[in-house]
C-alpha cells in the first residue's frame, strides 16, 4: 500500500499556502483528485509529488494515491482543506443525476472543518427543503439526500454559517429519474379493422412510460408513417399518441399496422390487420355438421359463427317444422362476440321432445343482405315392438312391427316354455330378418318396419319372441300360443313411452 506524506488523514491550510503531497510505493504510483487548478505533478520512479505554491479553496478535496501494479489495488488518501473565509464551499459538480430511491450526493466540499456545525442544505433562493427530505452531511463529500424522490428534482445550495451570516455555495441541480421497469406500455386500437372502400378509418397507436425518454412510431407493412405526435402526462406517466386518420380508405391502405415503442430498456411492438373490402359481407358457418342426430330426451346446442361487416342489423333462430309451429324460446338463444367482426350464436335445446325434431334456421341481416344457415335435427328412439298372429294366404303368420330410429333390426326367437323373454338356456331356434319391410320412413320421424314369421303349427308349450334393436336400445314382444288361441306379452319393462 502506498504511503502519503504528510502522514495525516486531513490537512488544513490557508489560501496562498504551499502544499506538497508526496506518495511513495513499491512501484510507480499515481495521484487522483478533484478537478482543481495550480497543481504541479512530479513523478520519479516509485514516488510522485503533487505540489502547489498557491493553494485556493478549489484545491479542497480528497487526494488518493494508487499503485497501478499492485494486484491488491491498495491506495492511500489525504483530505485537504483550504479554508477561505470568503469561500466556505468547493462545489465539484453542476448537476447530479440519480434514479429514484438512490442516495444523491451533492458534492459541496466544506473548505473549513470548523464550519461543520453550522451547515445546512437549502433550495435555491433560500427556499426550505421539501417535507420528508432526509439528508446527512460529510465535510469530505458533501450532502447526501437519502432515497431521493422524483419530486426532489430541484436546484440546491449548500449553506454555511460564517460570522453569524449564511454563505451559500453555487447551485447544484438534482435530477431524480424514475426507475424504468421496462419498455413502454403500448396500445394499438382497434385490434382489427375492416372498412368498405371509400369509408373513413382511424388507427391509434399510443405508448406510455414513467420516463419521458422514449420513442414511438406506427408502421404500415414495414414502412414507418410520418404522423404528428400528441404528448400528455397523467397518472404519473408520460403518454405519446399517434393517430392515423384515413378519410377514404382504398385497397393500398390495407395490411399490417405495427405500433412500436422503445426506450433504454428495450422495445415493445404490437400489430393489427386492416382489411379493405369492396362491399358489405355476411358469412355464416358452423363447425358442427348441419345434419344432427340426438337421442330423444337429451340436449343439443346449435352453434353458428357469423363474420360480418358492417355489423348485424338483425338475427334470429326459426323452427321450420315439420311438427309444430312452436318457435325457439329467446332465452335459449345466446350471442357471444369473439371480436369486432366475428360473433357466435348458440341455440340451446335441452331435453329434446319428439315434437322438437326438424329444421332450425339461423337468419342474420346486415347491409349486405340476408343469410341463413339451416340445421336438420333428427331424434333417435329405441325400438318399440308389437306382435300379432294372423293368416296370410292361408298360412299362420306371426307379424312383428318395430318402430324406432335409426331403423331397427329384427330377430325372432323360439324357446321352450312360457316366458316373457327368452333366455339363452331356453332358446330352440333363432331367425334373423336381414330385410324387414319398411312400412314408414318419413324425415324426422321414427322408421317402422314389419317382419313376418310363417309358422305351420304353433307349439303350445313354447314362446315366440320378436326382438328389435338399434344404436339407441332394444325392445321385444313375446307371443305365447295357448289352447284358447294366441296370447301376447309385451315385456315387463316397457323401454319407451312416447
Amino acid at each position: 500500500i502506498p504511503v502519503i506524506e504528510p502522514s495525516v488523514p486531513e490537512l488544513v491550510v490557508k489560501p496562498g499556502a504551499t502544499v506538497t503531497l508526496r506518495c511513495v510505493g513499491n512501484g510507480s504510483v499515481e495521484w487522483d483528485g478533484p478537478p482543481s487548478p495550480h497543481w504541479t505533478l512530479y513523478s520519479d520512479g516509485s514516488s510522485s509529488i503533487l505540489s502547489t505554491n498557491n493553494a485556493t479553496f478549489q484545491n479542497t478535496g480528497t487526494y488518493r494515491c494508487t499503485e497501478p501494479g499492485d494486484p491488491l489495488g491498495g491506495s492511500a488518501a489525504i483530505h485537504l482543506y483550504v479554508k477561505d473565509p470568503a469561500r466556505p464551499w468547493n462545489v465539484l459538480a453542476q448537476e447530479v443525476v440519480v434514479f429514484e430511491d438512490q442516495d444523491a450526493l451533492l458534492p459541496c466540499l466544506l473548505t473549513d472543518p470548523v464550519l461543520e456545525a453550522g451547515v445546512s442544505l437549502v433550495r435555491v433562493r433560500g427556499r426550505p427543503l421539501m417535507r420528508h427530505t432526509n439528508y446527512s452531511f460529510s465535510p469530505w463529500h458533501g450532502f447526501t439526500i437519502h432515497r431521493a424522490k422524483f419530486i426532489q428534482s430541484q436546484d440546491y445550495q449548500c449553506s454555511a454559517l460564517m460570522g453569524g451570516r449564511k454563505v451559500m455555495s453555487i447551485s447544484i441541480r438534482l435530477k431524480v429519474q424514475k426507475v424504468i421497469p421496462g419498455p413502454p406500455a403500448l396500445t394499438l386500437v382497434p385490434a382489427e379493422l375492416v372498412r368498405i372502400r371509400g369509408e373513413a378509418a382511424q388507427i391509434v397507436c399510443s405508448a406510455s412510460s414513467v420516463d419521458v425518454n422514449f420513442d414511438v412510431f406506427l408502421q404500415h407493412n414495414n414502412t414507418k408513417l410520418a404522423i404528428p405526435q400528441q404528448s400528455d402526462f397523467h397518472n404519473n406517466r408520460y403518454q405519446k399518441v399517434l393517430t392515423l386518420n384515413l378519410d377514404q380508405v382504398d385497397f393500398q391502405h390495407a395490411g399490417n399496422y405495427s405500433c412500436v415503442a422503445s426506450n433504454v430498456q428495450g422495445k415493445h411492438s404490437t400489430s393489427m390487420f386492416f382489411r379493405v373490402v369492396e362491399s358489405a359481407y355476411l358469412n355464416l358457418s358452423s363447425e358442427q355438421n348441419l345434419i344432427q342426430e340426438v337421442t330423444v330426451g337429451e340436449g343439443l346446442n346449435l352453434k353458428v359463427m357469423v363474420e360480418a361487416y358492417p355489423g348485424l342489423q338483425g338475427f334470429n333462430w326459426t323452427y321450420l317444422g315439420p311438427f309444430s309451429d312452436h318457435q325457439p324460446e329467446p332465452k335459449l338463444a345466446n350471442a357471444t362476440t369473439k371480436d369486432t367482426y366475428r360473433h357466435t350464436f348458440t341455440l340451446s335445446l335441452p331435453r329434446l321432445k319428439p315434437s322438437e325434431a326438424g329444421r332450425y334456421s339461423f337468419l342474420a341481416r346486415n347491409p349486405g343482405g340476408w343469410r341463413a344457415l339451416t340445421f336438420e335435427l333428427t331424434l333417435r328412439y329405441p325400438p318399440e315392438v308389437s306382435v300379432i298372429w294372423t293368416f296370410i294366404n292361408g298360412s299362420g303368420t306371426l307379424l312383428c312391427a318395430a318402430s324406432g330410429y335409426p331403423q331397427p333390426n329384427v330377430t325372432w326367437l323360439q324357446c321352450s316354455g312360457h316366458t316373457d323373454r327368452c333366455d339363452e338356456a331356453q332358446v330352440l331356434q333363432v331367425w334373423d330378418d336381414p330385410y324387414p319391410e319398411v312400412l314408414s320412413q318419413e324425415p324426422f320421424h321414427k322408421v317402422t318396419v314389419q317382419s313376418l314369421l310363417t309358422v305351420e303349427t304353433l307349439e303350445h308349450n313354447q314362446t315366440y319372441e320378436c326382438r328389435a334393436h338399434n344404436s339407441v336400445g332394444s325392445g321385444s314382444w313375446a307371443f305365447i300360443p295357448i289352447s284358447a288361441g294366441a296370447h301376447t306379452h309385451p315385456p315387463d319393462e316397457f323401454l319407451f313411452t312416447p
Epitope: 499515481e30 487522483d32 483528485g33 504541479t40 459538480a93 443525476v97 440519480v98
Partner: antibody, heavy 116, light 108 residues
Framework: QVQLQESGPGLVKPSETLSLTCTVS????????WSWIRQPPGKGLEWIGY??????TKNPSLKSRVTISVDTSKNQFSLKLSSVTAADTAVYYC???????????WGQGTTVTVSS | EIVLTQSPGTLSLSPGERATLSCRAS???????LAWYQQKPGQAPRLLIY???SRATGIPDRFSGSGSGTDFTLTISRLEPEDFAVYYC?????????FGQGTKLEIK
C-alpha cells in the same frame, strides 16, 4: 486493464433524444472521473462533459441539452443529448479522465447520424 | 473558455525527420494540465503526453513535450511510418476542457 465500450442507436431523428451508454470493464466506475467527447465528421474533438459518482460538469455550449448519469450496479455511464439536429452528427467517444493525467483510456467510438 | 490554436494545420515530413507541433493557448494554463493526443483514421485518440511533458504509459521516447504558460510544443525526434496521424493538444485545467483543432502530420 480498464476497457470502455460505447453502445446506442446509430441513427436518431431530428428533435429526438440521443442516448448512449459506455460500459466500463476491468475496473470500478466509482474510482475515476469519466468523460464524453465527440468528433463531427472531418472535424476536431469537442469535450461534452464528465461525471464522478453521480455528479457531472458539462460544456456550457451543450449544457442545457446534456444529461450524464451513472449506473454503478452495471458499471456503466450514459449520455443523453436532447433536441438533436444534424449538427450533432458525430463519432461519440467515452473516456476515463484523470485530473492529473488527461484522458488516458478511450472507447473505440460510436457513430451517430441525425437524420429524418 | 480557453481557446487552443495548433500550428501548422498540416505538416508534411518524411520518415526519419524531426517534427515540431505547436499549441498556443488564449490564456495562461498550468503546464500540469496540458495533454497531447494522437489519432489515426477510424481510431479513437490515444494519450501521448500529460502534464505538458510526461509521457503516458507505453509511449516511445521519441515523443516529447515541453512548454508553459501559453506556448506548448510536441516534438517527435525521428519520425516513424506509424507516426503519421492527426495530433491534438488539450487543456484540462479549466472547464470547459478544450482541444486544439488538430495538426495533420502527413508523409511528404
Amino acid at each position: 486493464q480498464v476497457q470502455l465500450q460505447e453502445s446506442g442507436p446509430g441513427l436518431v431523428k431530428p428533435s429526438e433524444t440521443l442516448s448512449l451508454t459506455c460500459t466500463v470493464s476491468g475496473g470500478s466506475i466509482s474510482s475515476y472521473y469519466w468523460s464524453w467527447i465527440r468528433q463531427p465528421p472531418g472535424k476536431g474533438l469537442e469535450w461534452i462533459g464528465y461525471i464522478y459518482y453521480s455528479g457531472s460538469t458539462k460544456n456550457p455550449s451543450l449544457k442545457s441539452r446534456v444529461t450524464i448519469s451513472v449506473d454503478t450496479s452495471k458499471n456503466q455511464f450514459s449520455l443523453k443529448l436532447s433536441s438533436v439536429t444534424a449538427a450533432d452528427t458525430a463519432v461519440y467517444y467515452c473516456a476515463r479522465w484523470r485530473t492529473f493525467y488527461g484522458m488516458d483510456v478511450w472507447g473505440q467510438g460510436t457513430t451517430v447520424t441525425v437524420s429524418s | 473558455e480557453i481557446v487552443l490554436t495548433q500550428s501548422p494545420g498540416t505538416l508534411s515530413l518524411s520518415p526519419g525527420e524531426r517534427a515540431t507541433l505547436s499549441c498556443r493557448a488564449s490564456q495562461s494554463i498550468s503546464s500540469s494540465y496540458l495533454a497531447w493526443y494522437q489519432q489515426k483514421p477510424g481510431q479513437a485518440p490515444r494519450l501521448l503526453i500529460y502534464g505538458a511533458s510526461s509521457r503516458a504509459t507505453g509511449i516511445p521516447d521519441r515523443f516529447s513535450g515541453s512548454g508553459s504558460g501559453t506556448d506548448f510544443t510536441l516534438t517527435i525526434s525521428r519520425l516513424e511510418p506509424e507516426d503519421f496521424a492527426v495530433y491534438y493538444c488539450q487543456q484540462y485545467g479549466s472547464s470547459p476542457y478544450t482541444f486544439g483543432q488538430g495538426t495533420k502530420l502527413e508523409i511528404k
